[in-house]
Structures are given as structure tokens and as C-alpha cells.
Interface confidence: medium
């Protein structure tokens, strides 16, 4: 059976990709269940995740308002079966999360090579352009529409036949590059914020795509493109 | 009545990565689970790799963190397991597992509860 | 880390016989995240004790489970054939989660 002690969580954590962002902690609750609170340094606090049993809670729709402000949140430990009474007075256990800046900390997700498309000695690679859930407008906006030319992107590209690595950066999601007649290419890119001096600094790279595989072959003059 | 099985190569060549699917039929990954790796050494006991929550939450084995990436994949009941820079010290039956939280009497309670058959996976050049 | 340390390593009993085997945790584990599971070669492990004493469905009834913070047990009240197994104790509640090294319980 249950009892009516309660634990306050720990490690709190925060998990954010392009923006969704979740708030995760131990423990895994015994006879407790839990409710998460979050606002800016000025703002009031606000609850979600009412009394669950999870170990995290999805703040997106809190962070998006303004990801340049800084959020707190604090996690709430209640008793497992606990319906709010309006007589308690007792506050209950919690702890607070590390403070959590969007637009400087969300990890930027791995990138996606859209197309390319030679012709002649030039290819023009293009990045697929990530939607967030930042809105503007009732508009949903892309990851180059936040962060605008803090974003760069870094290609990598090199001769099926060789190893040897160039690279080319680009503040738009497009890159045009010299390429050597008759010679297939691979090419994968990385999303870098150069002003961040944190390891979210960059973005995994993308997975490498090639000339002339799988969807038929680059001819000199042709297109190749890439639809994920 | 849920079941999980795993699918994925036998043999993986040294340095390459390690990869697993776990499908889950006659119930849903979304259902309030975690889902597990476990893998057990020839002849030896077992050990957990990590597990996942249906949003896409991981917890991994600090012993195997750097190299191990847990991810699903809601719309066709799956998740899966890649373990990257593999040696023979990786050579294993790798088994997938339901984590289930279990409210009872003001409490909750953890276990294993479903596990697959388990697949043999050989590393080898 | 919470290391499970099993004992004994092997057991050799007769059908009939009562089984009893240990689980010593390195540090205090809360019984809700305490489970035992039996594993036949070439087959998963089968869960048989949650809570630490909880049987899990369809188990049968000569299996029960005792024990609290860093001592808990399993016993078998009467071994039948197919109870000659390997039984593993696990704590799911501290990353890592653990399993202890195994009870080998052989046909004497």
C-alpha cells in the first residue's frame, strides 16, 4: 500500500530540439505524482502537467511566447491519488530546473540535404528548411525565420572516389559549388550558430547523400532531387 | 495481448553500427510504457542499455551512453536500438522489453513485464 | 550504480525441495521498483515478482518474494521440473538499472 510521503524530484533536465522542448526528472514516481510549474524571471508562474506520473513534461507551448526570455520551472511532488484540496496549506516538496534560455540553448535538430542539382561544373545544393513551433501571426516559422543569420550551414562535400573532405558555409539554406566534370559527389550538412561557445553550438550532420544513387543517375545537365 | 519482436542483421563488422527494431503488436507504443534494451553476453547475466518513453524520452546505461541511441517511431509501433563503434565485447543477444508502470493502492510499482524472443547479434570482420 | 549481488551462485536441489535465494543491493532499493524473473536457456527472461513480493500474472503460487531495502528473497516452496532455471533479481527505479549476476538452480 501507498503511503502519503512524498519526494521532491531531482536531476531536472531540459530537452530541447529546434524548439519543443521537454522538461525531464527522476525518480520515477512511487506514491507520488507530480505537477510542473514554469514562467520568465518576471511572469507568473504557470502550471502544466497536472499530477502525472511521468517523468517529463512538454513545455513548447510555454517557450515559444518568447524564446529569448530566460524560463524557470519547477517540478511539484503531491501525494499518488492526491485531488487539490482548497483547506491545505502545507506546500509540497519541489525543486527548480536550471534556468533555460530558448534561442541560446535549443540543441539545433539534424538537418536534411532538400535537393541538388548539377549543371555543368556547378552544383546547387539546397537545405530543407525546418519548421519550429514558434509562431508569429498564427504563423508557424522556420528555423532560418527565429534565428535569421545567426544560422549558418556548413556543407561537406567529397569525390565518391576519394576521401579527402571540402567544405563550403552558406547564411542562406543554398549552396552553390564548383564541382569537377564527370565526377560524382556526397554531401552532407551541419546547422552551426557561430556566436554560441556551447556544445550546442552544432547540429549532428546530416545524412550523407550522393550523385548518381539510388534515384537515378546526375547526368551533367540533369536534376537530382531528394524529397524527404 | 502485447508482443515485441526484434529484427535487425546478425552480424556487424567492427567500428560499423549496431542496429535494432523492436515492433510491437496487439497494443500501443503511446500507451504509457517505457520500452527497454536489454542484452545478454554468452553465457553471462543481463544488462540494460536504456530505455525510451513514447514522446521520445531516453535514460541510457552511463556504461554505454556515448555510444548508443534509442529512438521511436509512433506511427508504426516501433523503436529501436543503434550502438555505434562495435567490438566483440558487443556480441550479444539483444532483447526488447516493456517497462510498465503499475498504479495499485496509492503506489506504483516497476517491472518488465513483456520481453521479446531476443536476437543474436555477432560481431565480426 | 546499485550493483545486485546474488546468492548463492548455484543451487542444486531436488524436485520437491524448497528454493531459497538472495539479493543483496549495494544501497537501499524501494521495493516498488524490485523484481525477480526466471530465464530457461534460449528463451527471454519471464517476469514471476514485482514490488519485491507481488506475483505477476499466471504465476504460480509456491513463488513468493519478501524483503525491503537492500535485502529481498525469493522462494520456490516446492521445485517442480520446470523450475530448474536461472533467476535474476532487478531494480528499476536508479539509472543504471541492474540485474544481479543470477541463481543457477540445477537438478541435484
Known amino acids: 500500500s501507498g503511503t502519503t510521503n512524498t519526494v521532491a524530484a531531482y536531476n531536472l533536465t531540459w530537452k530541447s530540439t529546434n524548439f519543443k522542448t521537454i522538461l525531464e526528472w527522476e525518480p520515477k514516481p512511487i506514491n507520488q505524482v507530480y505537477t510542473v510549474q514554469i514562467s520568465t524571471k518576471s511572469g507568473d508562474w504557470k502550471s502544466k502537467c497536472f499530477y502525472t506520473a511521468d517523468t517529463e513534461c512538454d513545455l513548447t507551448d510555454e517557450i515559444v511566447k518568447d524564446v529569448k526570455q530566460t524560463y524557470l520551472a519547477r517540478v511539484f511532488s503531491y501525494p499518488a491519488g492526491h485531488v487539490e484540496s482548497t483547506g491545505s496549506t502545507e506546500e509540497p516538496p519541489y525543486e527548480n530546473s536550471p534556468e533555460f534560455t530558448p534561442y541560446l540553448e535549443t540543441n539545433l535538430g539534424q538537418p536534411t540535404i532538400q535537393s541538388f542539382e548539377q549543371v555543368g561544373t556547378k552544383v546547387n545544393v539546397t537545405v530543407q528548411d525546418e519548421w519550429t513551433l514558434v509562431r508569429r501571426n498564427d504563423t508557424f516559422l522556420s528555423l532560418r525565420d527565429v534565428f535569421g543569420k545567426d544560422l549558418i550551414y556548413t556543407l561537406y562535400y567529397w569525390k565518391s572516389s576519394s576521401s579527402g573532405k571540402k567544405t563550403a558555409k552558406t547564411n542562406t539554406n543554398e549552396f552553390l559549388i564548383d564541382v569537377d566534370k564527370g565526377e560524382n559527389y556526397c554531401f552532407s550538412v551541419q546547422a552551426v550558430i557561430p556566436s554560441r561557445r556551447t556544445a550546442n553550438r552544432k547540429s549532428t550532420d546530416s545524412p550523407v547523400e550522393c550523385m548518381g544513387h539510388e534515384k537515378g543517375e546526375s547526368r551533367e545537365t540533369g536534376h537530382h532531387h531528394h524529397h524527404h | 495481448q502485447v508482443q515485441l519482436q526484434e529484427s535487425g542483421p546478425g552480424l556487424v563488422k567492427p567500428s560499423q553500427t549496431l542496429s535494432l527494431t523492436c515492433t510491437v503488436s496487439?497494443?500501443?507504443?503511446?500507451?504509457?510504457?517505457?520500452w527497454s534494451w536489454i542484452r545478454q553476453h554468452p553465457g553471462k547475466g543481463l544488462e540494460w542499455i536504456g530505455e525510451i518513453y513514447y514522446s521520445g524520452s531516453t535514460r541510457y546505461n552511463p556504461s554505454l551512453k556515448s555510444r548508443v541511441t534509442i529512438s521511436v517511431d509512433t506511427s508504426k509501433n516501433q523503436f529501436s536500438l543503434k550502438l555505434s563503434s562495435v567490438t566483440a565485447a558487443d556480441t550479444a543477444v539483444y532483447y526488447c522489453?516493456?517497462?510498465?508502470?503499475?498504479?495499485?493502492?496509492?503506489?506504483?510499482?516497476?517491472?518488465?513485464?513483456?520481453w521479446g524472443k531476443g536476437t543474436t547479434v555477432t560481431v565480426s570482420s | 550504480e546499485i550493483v545486485l549481488t546474488q546468492s548463492p551462485g548455484t543451487l542444486s536441489l531436488s524436485p520437491g525441495e524448497r528454493a531459497t535465494l538472495s539479493c543483496r543491493a549495494s544501497?537501499?532499493?524501494?521495493?516498488?521498483?524490485l523484481a525477480w524473473y526466471q530465464q530457461k536457456p534460449g528463451q527471454a527472461p519471464r517476469l514471476l515478482i514485482y514490488?519485491?513480493?507481488s506475483r505477476a500474472t499466471g504465476i504460480p503460487d509456491r513463488f513468493s518474494g519478501s524483503g525491503s531495502g537492500t535485502d529481498f528473497t525469493l522462494t520456490i516452496s516446492r521445485l517442480e521440473p520446470e523450475d530448474f532455471a536461472v533467476y535474476y533479481c532487478q531494480q528499476v527505479g536508479v539509472v543504471p538499472y541492474t540485474f544481479g549476476g543470477g541463481t543457477k538452480v540445477e537438478i541435484k
Open positions: 522489453a516493456r517497462d510498465t508502470p503499475y498504479y495499485y493502492d496509492g503506489g506504483y510499482y516497476y517491472y518488465m513485464d513483456v
Open positions: 544501497q537501499s532499493v524501494s521495493s516498488s521498483y
Open positions: 496487439g497494443g500501443s507504443i503511446s500507451s504509457g510504457q517505457y
Open positions: 514490488g519485491a513480493s
